[in-house]
């Protein structure tokens, strides 16, 4: 018999490598039985997790599981970091594992001088 507790299925030590400027959806898989719990996202800052109040979120319902989605439209360089989802269920707080976003800032990467450029114009290193 399956448990009727709410379960949050973010994988432990999970990571996502994403590009700044792209859209991205961060999913929190949620299993529940009857009433859908209230779920929130937060971003880790040291040992505290700061609730993300004014961010676009949505639900996606599938047959055996639902997903509470945090939307990044677009991804920004400072979205880099670790996130966690939490559910309130029967006055209990259930927390997921954290998941880490590694954001590559394509703009600054493309602005960096190439190896060839650096070799032929070493003063670029000091500008």
């Amino acid at each position: 018999k399956e448990s009727c507790d709410v379960q949050l299925y973010i994988k432990r030590q999970s990571e996502h490598s994403i590009l700044a400027g792209d859209p991205f959806e961060l999913e929190c898989p949620v299993k529940y039985c009857a009433n859908r719990p209230h779920v929130t996202w937060c971003k880790l800052n040291g040992t505290t997790c700061v609730k993300l109040e004014d961010r676009q979120t949505s639900w996606k319902e599938e047959k055996n599981i639902s997903f509470f989605i945090l939307h990044f439209e677009p991804v920004l360089p400072n979205d880099n970091g670790s996130y966690r989802c939490s559910a309130n269920f029967q006055s209990n707080l259930i927390e997921s594992h954290s998941t880490t976003l590694y954001v590559t800032d394509v703009k600054s990467a493309s602005e960096r001088p190439s190896k060839d450029e650096m070799a032929s114009r070493p003063w670029l290193l000091y500008r």
Epitope: Y9, K11, Q13, E15, H16, S17, H97
Partner: antibody
């Protein structure tokens, strides 16, 4: 019931490449991490690395970084371990192991694939 | 990397006797989530390893309750009260707290 079916015995020449497969039934690999473990003859177990089939993210033991490549195909529910430039040190039994809901608990093991490297 | 040291290397027992295997880690396996990712596996001759115990002391389904796991931090023990023939094989501890994940060297349980 969960079952991990691994590909058959491989006999390869030094310098060659090989791709071992592990097909899961009874679970969706998107919901797991798929790990690979090496066991040389009469030796212990070594963790090679793992892949998150949901996004392709991989983690390796540094000694296998650059030697092994992990990939997966969610449409066929299959994970792969690829080795290039084989040497006699790579001769071993390789196990795939699932980790349901990415819980770091290594719950189900395949039957193993024996890789022999000989000229 | 975290080094997992198992003792003894070989354990010779009489069927029905109790057995104890030690596993020590080079650093605490207590994770920031409050869990300790320490598993025990048994590999019977000619077979794949099978998980017996996860999170130090949680017995896997189908594993007899003569197996008990205990410990915390860096020191862990697997005890078998009344060894049966089906318990013979090589026992491995494994940590999944830190990358790279690591196994102990194994303890062979055999009959005298």
């Amino acid at each position: 019931e969960v079952h991990l079916q691994q590909s058959g015995t491989e006999l390869m020449k030094p310098g060659a490449s090989v791709k071992l497969s592990c097909t899961a039934s009874g679970l969706n690999i998107r919901d797991t991490y798929m790990h690979w473990v090496k066991q040389r003859p009469e030796q212990g177990l070594e963790w090679i690395g793992r892949i998150d089939p949901a996004n392709g993210n991989t983690k390796f033991d540094p000694k296998f970084q650059g030697k092994a490549t992990l990939t997966s195909d969610t449409s066929s529910n299959t994970a792969y371990l690829h080795f290039s430039s084989l040497t006699s040190e790579d001769a071993a039994v390789y196990y795939c192991v699932s980790d349901h809901y990415g819980s770091s608990l290594l719950d189900y093991w395949g039957q193993g694939t024996s890789l022999t490297v000989s000229s | 990397e975290v080094v997992m040291t198992q003792t003894p290397l070989t354990l010779s027992v009489t069927i029905g006797q109790s057995a104890s295997i030690s596993c020590k880690s080079s650093q605490s396996l207590l994770d920031s989530d409050g869990k300790t990712y320490l598993n025990w596996f048994l590999q019977r001759p000619g077979q794949s390893p099978k998980r017996l115990m996860h999170l130090v002391s949680k017995l896997d389904s189908g594993v007899p309750d003569r197996f008990t796991g205990s410990g915390s931090g860096t020191d862990f023990t697997l005890k078998i009260s009344g060894v049966e023939a089906e318990d013979l094989g090589v026992y491995y501890c494994w940590q999944g707290t830190y990358f790279p994940y690591t196994f102990g060297g194994g303890t062979k349980l055999e009959t005298k």
